[in-house]
Amino acid sequence: GSTVPPMVNVTCSEVSEGNITVTCRASSFYPRNITLTWRQDGVSLSHNTQQWGDVLPDGNGTYQTWVATRIRQGEEQRFTCYMEHSGNHGTHPVPSGNSHHHHHHHH
């Protein structure tokens, strides 16, 4: 089938002691091969500080996956989610302030 670019969605959830978990979800993409990673100051985070979900079918002939990491509250602007899929790439910031969701569709 033809390439379907992912929808990328970055969310934050509060956790204890001034830390938050940021999750980057990629959905509705095809083919299933994708790179999704968190970067701190432009440099990819070590693998042992990130958690990845499996790349799973989402029921529409496309796929979905996610990557998460824990960061200190107030340092959101230093982290970005980097996505590569079928030759396309994109960088997605962590939403700042009270805005806890960010969606972007790649073309």
């Epitope: 701190q40 100051d41 432009g42 440099v43 990819s44 985070l45 070590s46 500080t49 200190r72 230093r78 970005t80 980097y82 590569e84 790439h89 960088t91 910031p93």
Partner: antibody, heavy 121, light 108 residues
Framework: DVQLVESGGGLVQPGGSRKLSCAAS????????IHWVRQAPEKGLEWVAY????????YYADTVKGRFTISRDNPKNTLFLQMTSLRSEDTAMYYC??????????????WGQGTTLTVSS | QIVLTQSPAIMSASLGERVTMTCTAT???????LHWYQQKPGSSPKLWIY???NLASGVPARFSGSGSGTSYSLTIGSMEAEDAATYYC?????????FGTGTKVEIK
Amino acid sequence: DVQLVESGGGLVQPGGSRKLSCAASGFTFSTFGIHWVRQAPEKGLEWVAYISYDSRTIYYADTVKGRFTISRDNPKNTLFLQMTSLRSEDTAMYYCARWAYEGGVNYFDNWGQGTTLTVSS
Amino acid sequence: QIVLTQSPAIMSASLGERVTMTCTATSGVSSSYLHWYQQKPGSSPKLWIYSSSNLASGVPARFSGSGSGTSYSLTIGSMEAEDAATYYCHQFHRSPLTFGTGTKVEIK
């Protein structure tokens, strides 16, 4: 003014060890990632190692992995490079360089004057 | 690791001449993570072009950068004496980070 001052270089025998230091001043050290970059005599730049501001992310060049250890002491504004099993090819000027973050762009914006390490018998 | 090979290694250019050097990567690099640095003898490197095509502060407009994927280039539109230096490309798309082999530009 931002200042990075390296020290600890000198003459070391092959197989020996050395610890380089980089003393930082003029900025909030604990908020910047720092790299070590080296330059052998009459050669190009070679990236050596990186440590993020919070020591969470550390990377090494393949040529030094397993032999060199980068670390930092934020309260003392100091970066370190512990080098073991030194080889003649480690002979170089060693620079520490600050990793800036501005408007979503990251780059080396300040460098020390370097410290020279010579590995020779 | 991503190896960056620069060509030519050394080049001589006359004043006013157009100069182009290339940086070739062994695997794809996002343009956001590809910078160029200028280094003169006895000095530390300076950021020259960032994210493939953006001039750093203070860099003359005669410089330009372009490229994508595995091939990038730096061009000096009209060579001036102060441009004599060594230029390095640098990638942080993937770890380990790497510098290019360098292109030394001399005055003919």
